[in-house]
Interface confidence: medium
Amino acid sequence: SSPTSSASSFSSSAPFLASAVSAQPPLPDQCPALCECSEAARTVKCVNRNLTEVPTDLPAYVRNLFLTGNQLAVLPAGAFARRPPLAELAALNLSGSRLDEVRAGAFEHLPSLRQLDLSHNPLADLSPFAFSGSNASVSAPSPLVELILNHIVPPEDERQNRSFEGMVVAALLAGRALQGLRRLELASNHFLYLPRDVLAQLPSLRHLDLSNNSLVSLTYVSFRNLTHLESLHLEDNALKVLHNGTLAELQGLPHIRVFLDNNPWVCDCHMADMVTWLKETEVVQGKDRLTCAYPEKMRNRVLLELNSADLDCDPILPPSLQTS
């Protein structure tokens, strides 16, 4: 690599010419050990360095901070609090850094933080006040507009004796701090259900990714308040059917695109309304790819090609006639 630093390159050292001419590097802001910095790009990368804590000497200019692939374990309160504050930090990526605990107020004193990625960390303990910073019933609004929490589920033996879904939702709803959140990604978290109140309290959502979970039903989930929702990813879940109430709510969202691929749709009499809706709606992307998984006789049939005669339910036998 060239010894001189250009405006677009990442620098982890003073420009070579400056250090060759004088013994002192230019000072405006230093670059932490084990990081690469570009003042021109306002970016600091401390990537795959096995860091066990957030560097304390981050340059004040940082706008984009990558701390991926480390061994941080715990994010304490005020993990990014500095004097003067990191006033320009807008995008923070902590993915794959072996975090298992994020404490209350971990992201306090970051007034410009708009994007936060905590993906691929086994978060056994996510404080309810991780994003809100305080336990007040109504907190100061968080500046976050994008929150990426894909694959944050810890191994089963490391989970606390509580609902993982509940822990995550508590953090999302605490203090109503995330009212401005526009993108929420919760893919690959083994979610069995979506607590009914979560979406109602995130009214600004444009993009919601719940793909690759274990959602069986959306019966108790309301999308009605999400009038700005543009994309809803529900691929690779365990959905069997969408009922009338859900279908009507989705149809009523003006900008929505829904992704439903790779769900084990049960093509019996309960599927009739969904099939009718699918044939008429424009909101489902790739609807021609949706196929039945059950019952066996219907496996791999395309939902759009079904008619009401195909969708029957076995009669419920009176107990005296049932066999084991």
């Epitope: 050292s13 003073a14 250090s19 230093q30 670059c31 050990a33 084990l34």
Partner: antibody
């Protein structure tokens, strides 16, 4: 001219303590991260500890963690290494070394070293 | 920890002839932009002196007969024409992560 001068070495019994100093001159000390590196008799180099320019970040080798403490006084242009619970395997020449504000460029100036002998 | 393996252990070179020392890291010490690998020379009774920084950048004041190359895990220090004053032990060192580690050293002697 950049100069780093270590002092404080000597002979000490196992379990005892010693404090090394490194006096810096010829550059703006407070702009630079500083390291301690040691070399056992007839052996290679072993990195020991690092402190950032403003004393906000410290790193230690596993072999000294919990026993050694690196510190600095920017007003005195001096780096320190407090060595407690010394062991025979800590016997070495101890060098202080400077790294620029940015870390891609290695340890660009070294002191002459001070000898620590741990022996009963 | 990243292990730095230097070869050969020692080298006996005729003045004016080239010499080459290899250093292999147990994992990559290069980002997409930079290599965090440095070479030092230690003459008898003296502290180490930085020769090459970031794999290939010659430190100020170092003769240009020294050169460095490599990225990822494999790095090489070359002396194009060895001189008598080049005797000493040469070490590679990474600054990719904590702990920084050094190679075991290569002793260069003059025939």
């Amino acid at each position: 001219e950049v100069q780093l001068v270590e002092s404080g070495g000597g002979v000490v019994q196992p379990g005892r303590s010693l404090r090394l100093s490194c006096a810096a001159s010829g550059f703006t000390f407070s702009n630079f991260g500083m390291h301690w590196v040691r070399q056992a008799p007839g052996k290679g180099l072993e990195w020991v500890a690092y402190i950032s320019s403003g004393s906000s970040t410290f790193y230690y080798a596993d072999s000294v963690k919990g026993r050694f403490t690196i510190s600095r006084d920017n007003s005195k242009n001096t780096l320190y290494l407090q060595m407690n619970s010394l062991r025979a395997e800590d016997t070495a020449v101890y060098f202080c070394a400077r790294s620029p504000a940015y870390y891609r460029y290695g340890l660009d100036y070294w002191g002459q070293g001070t000898t620590v002998t741990v022996s009963s | 920890d990243i292990v730095m393996t230097q070869t050969p252990l020692s080298l006996s070179v005729t003045p004016g002839q080239p010499a080459s020392i290899s250093c292999r890291a147990s994992q990559s010490v290069s980002s997409s932009t930079f290599s965090y690998m440095h070479w030092y020379q230690q003459k008898p009774g003296q502290p180490p002196q930085l020769l090459i920084k970031s794999s290939s950048n010659l430190e100020s004041g170092v003769p240009d007969r020294f050169s460095g190359s490599g990225s990822g895990t494999d790095f090489t220090l070359k002396i194009s024409r060895v001189e008598a004053e080049d005797v000493g032990v040469y070490y590679c060192q990474h600054s990719w992560e904590i702990p920084y580690t050094f190679g075991g050293g290569t002793k260069v002697e003059i025939k």
